[in-house]
């Protein structure tokens, strides 16, 4: 009797005939910016307060017939998905609705901006508990709308938005492209990305995760007891807003960065069929389907990390790409990736008082991506140690020499265009895990961090014959912070982290001869925090 979508987001330990996870988000208020809603529907009656905010454009067409049930359809359904009695995710959450979409589901950037400002002012006048803002709408890229979302997020509000239903790169839409917003794509009961007519869910690096978004049961505005199935990334975003409300109700002090990391951590991994996405978007799109944590408490001991991809650099010779972590996150490693294999590596550098990850394109290259590994590491003190090109036969080396600092990531950057061609591989001397090793013509950057109880170890996986992909994963209890390839593998396209696995990609094996250069070694740096583990044990 449980709708498929609620079953999908529920960890096995909660599963019974009915969906009844502990604490329904009762400490959290969810703001919904959408159409008008039918607030007397039995599913949401008494749970949703309709504010007096309304800022919508006129409906198109002279013959448009405004029918209440049609005007309320989208918003009523979403309110039900978030907090409905029968088919809602966070049955205890209270909601407030703002009307920014008209009866045809159309709105304006200015109307949405004014709505966000209304929420900000309400928050200042009457501060309550944690706030979640659900934006189940998408329009063309808007710098001003993204900036407004950033301001609200930095004021401590969690914003959740739909990726958009255009079967396109979510980065081309707002507010989906705002980095501070949690952007949600849609999947169906078969864990396939949702197709909607000739279009479907958006995808790409601006999507944080996916959630159920096809045939979602929710309140229908046709009558006060009616229910209907609706589909789209709006429905997917409503699931994540509900999950966020549940998590924040259990841990009201969670920051946006902590919440996002938890959403990613507790998601189902690698269940989406990526063949649906355009080939160039597959590596950028997170293969994550949102789920409730198995227990609403006790996740504090884990070291949480996520992978952040930059925008594409473009093909010019000196083009660079920059990946940034959120304000509350630490950049623990930096890597790069180029489909053509022509790149000049990457480096961690300070920008505005924060470390960023910058990747460099090479002459003749089609462009690069920078890939940041962004982690939650309280009381961390991280720095980058750089060794210039050594010009010595043993290659370039750099290690963490400060007392108590551990190596969390290695990057290498070079000026020459054809680094590594016809050069034998440089092997890391055993028993020296706290150092980065690179080509003699490359500068090497070590990310060195000190944090209470932080310990890290290096794990390698080498394959002597050419392989398009080599992976190495951190074991249970350890978190991947760094991912790189050992030097000597000139055909490497780059390295990146997928969940807890380091992936090193190489050129198509048919184009690389089976020489010594065919050897590919993936290097993972796996860390854990004993301090966080002890702290959480004390709290329980």
């Amino acid at each position: 009797s449980i709708p498929w979508n609620l079953e999908r987001i529920t960890p096995p330990r909660y599963r019974a005939d009915e969906y009844q996870p502990p604490d329904g988000g009762s400490l959290v208020e969810v703001y919904l910016l959408d159409t008008s809603i039918q607030s007397d529907h039995r599913e949401i009656e008494g749970r949703v307060m309709v504010t007096d905010f309304e800022n919508v454009p006129e409906e198109d067409g002279t013959r448009f017939h405004r029918q209440a049930s049609k005007c309320d359809s989208h918003g009523t359904h979403l309110a039900g998905v978030v907090s409905g009695r029968d088919a809602g995710v966070a049955k205890g959450a209270s909601m407030r609705s703002l009307r920014v979409l008209n009866c045809q589901g159309k709105g304006t950037v200015s109307g949405t901006l004014i709505g966000l400002e209304f929420i900000r002012k309400s928050q200042l006048v009457q501060p309550v508990g944690p706030l979640v803002v659900l934006l189940p709408l998408a329009g063309g890229y808007s710098r001003v709308l993204n900036a407004a979302c950033q301001r609200l997020a930095r004021a401590g509000v969690v914003l959740v938005t739909a990726a958009g239903n255009f079967r396109d790169d979510a980065c081309l839409y707002s507010p989906a492209s705002a980095p501070e917003v949690i952007t949600v794509g849609a999947t169906n009961a078969q864990d396939q990305p949702v197709t909607l007519g000739t279009l479907g869910t958006n995808f790409g690096r601006c999507v944080d995760l996916f959630a159920p978004g096809e045939d979602i049961i929710g309140a229908s505005s046709d009558c006060s007891t009616c229910f209907v199935s609706q589909s789209g990334t709006s429905q997917a975003a409503a699931h994540v807003a509900g999950i966020a409300a549940m998590m924040l109700s259990a841990e009201p002090e969670l920051t946006l960065a902590e919440l996002r990391q938890r959403l990613i951590h507790f998601s189902a991994k690698d269940v989406i069929n990526e063949a649906w996405f355009p080939e160039d978007q597959r590596v950028l799109t997170p293969n994550l389907v949102a789920a409730l944590p198995p227990s609403t408490h006790g996740a504090g001991w884990q070291l949480f990390c996520r992978t952040v991809w930059s925008a594409h650099s473009g093909p010019t010779r000196m083009a660079t790409a920059v990946a940034r972590c959120a304000p509350d996150e630490e950049l623990l490693s930096c890597s790069s990736f180029s489909r053509s294999g022509k790149r000049r590596g990457e480096r961690m550098e300070a920008q505005g008082g924060k470390l960023v990850c910058r990747a460099h394109n090479a002459f003749g290259g089609e462009g690069v991506y920078a890939i940041a590994r962004c982690c939650l590491l309280p009381q961390a003190n991280c720095s980058v140690h750089t060794a210039p090109p050594a010009e010595a036969s043993m290659g370039t080396r750099v290690h963490c020499h400060q007392q108590g600092h551990v190596l969390t990531g290695c990057s290498s950057h070079w000026e020459v265009e054809d680094l590594g061609t016809h050069k034998p591989p440089v092997l890391r001397p055993r028993g020296q895990p706290n150092q980065c090793v690179g080509h003699r013509e490359a500068s090497i950057h070590a990310s060195c961090c000190h944090a209470p109880g932080l310990e890290c170890k290096v794990k390698e996986h080498g394959i002597p014959a050419p392989q398009e992909q080599v992976t190495v994963a951190c074991e249970e209890g350890w978190t991947l912070t760094g991912c790189s390839a050992l030097p000597g593998t000139s055909h490497v396209l780059g390295a990146y982290a997928v969940d807890n696995t380091c992936v090193v990609r190489s050129r198509d094996v048919s184009t690389t001869g089976s020489t010594s250069e065919g050897a590919v070694t993936a290097v993972a740096i796996c860390c854990r925090s004993r301090h966080l583990a002890q702290a959480s044990q004390e709290l329980q």
Epitope: A189, D215, T225, V228
Partner: antibody, heavy 116, light 110 residues
């Protein structure tokens, strides 16, 4: 399970059919309405769950409503047309679900004729 | 909407023989929630099988349901005269408005 209220009505005249149950509680089961035009197959109309939630086939388009009391389930045909001429059945779903699963108990049906 | 297509009627079966009726769905049936019903003229349908293969209480084991996804089959072995009836499958996909019955298959027993 027993249906009642079926009769001859003129097109456009609202008609309410009632399904009366005994021996079990509507607070534990979903109830479905299914119809069968003369000489034709079965057609699912809609259902009401124990919670009171109602849902309908996509072809319904607001032509029917379902409601219930502690022992009865009503199907209202808001504006009957001759195409609504059929025997209307009420059936219990032991799964109390959103998807047809176990329609284990059926009433004998009640005949509705819509004609001018 | 999900469309359930059944074996065209009528299907003939000899007493003691075996008859199979297929039910194909245009969309994957959610959780294999596919049911089979038997209906005789002037009577309401009788519940035979649920979840594609689970026999309803009191139904003889001669009736067997199988299949998953979009393709399902009802098999009646050791056919009896009393099995002459129209058989319907019912189910739906994840859209709650797509619950539906198949068109029915009449079984004639010789």
């Amino acid at each position: 399970v027993e249906e009642s209220g079926g009769r001859l009505v003129t097109p456009g005249t609202p008609l309410t059919l009632t399904c009366t149950v005994s021996g079990f509680s509507l607070s534990s089961y979903a109830m479905n309405w299914v119809r069968q035009a003369p000489g034709k197959g079965l057609e699912w109309i809609g259902a009401i769950r124990s919670s009171g939630a109602t849902f309908f086939a996509s072809w319904v388009n607001g032509r029917f409503t379902i409601s219930k009391t502690s022992t009865t389930v009503d199907l209202k045909i808001t504006s009957p047309t001759p195409e609504d001429t059929a025997t209307y059945f009420c059936a219990r779903d032991t799964n109390d679900g959103w998807y047809i699963n176990r329609l284990d108990l059926w009433g004998p049906g009640t005949l509705v004729t819509v004609s001018s | 909407a999900a469309v359930l297509t059944q074996t065209p009627s009528p299907v003939s079966a000899a007493v003691g023989g075996t008859v199979s009726i297929s039910c194909q769905s245009s969309k994957s049936v959610y959780s294999n929630y596919l049911s089979w019903f038997q209906q005789k003229p002037g009577q309401p349908p009788k519940f035979l099988i649920y979840k594609a293969s689970t026999l309803a209480s009191g139904v003889p084991s001669r009736f067997k349901g199988s299949g998953s996804g979009t393709q399902f089959t009802l098999t009646i072995s050791d056919v009896q005269c009393d099995d002459a009836a129209t058989y319907y499958c019912a189910g739906g996909d994840t859209n709650i408005s797509d619950n539906a019955f198949g068109g029915g298959t009449e079984v004639v027993v010789k």
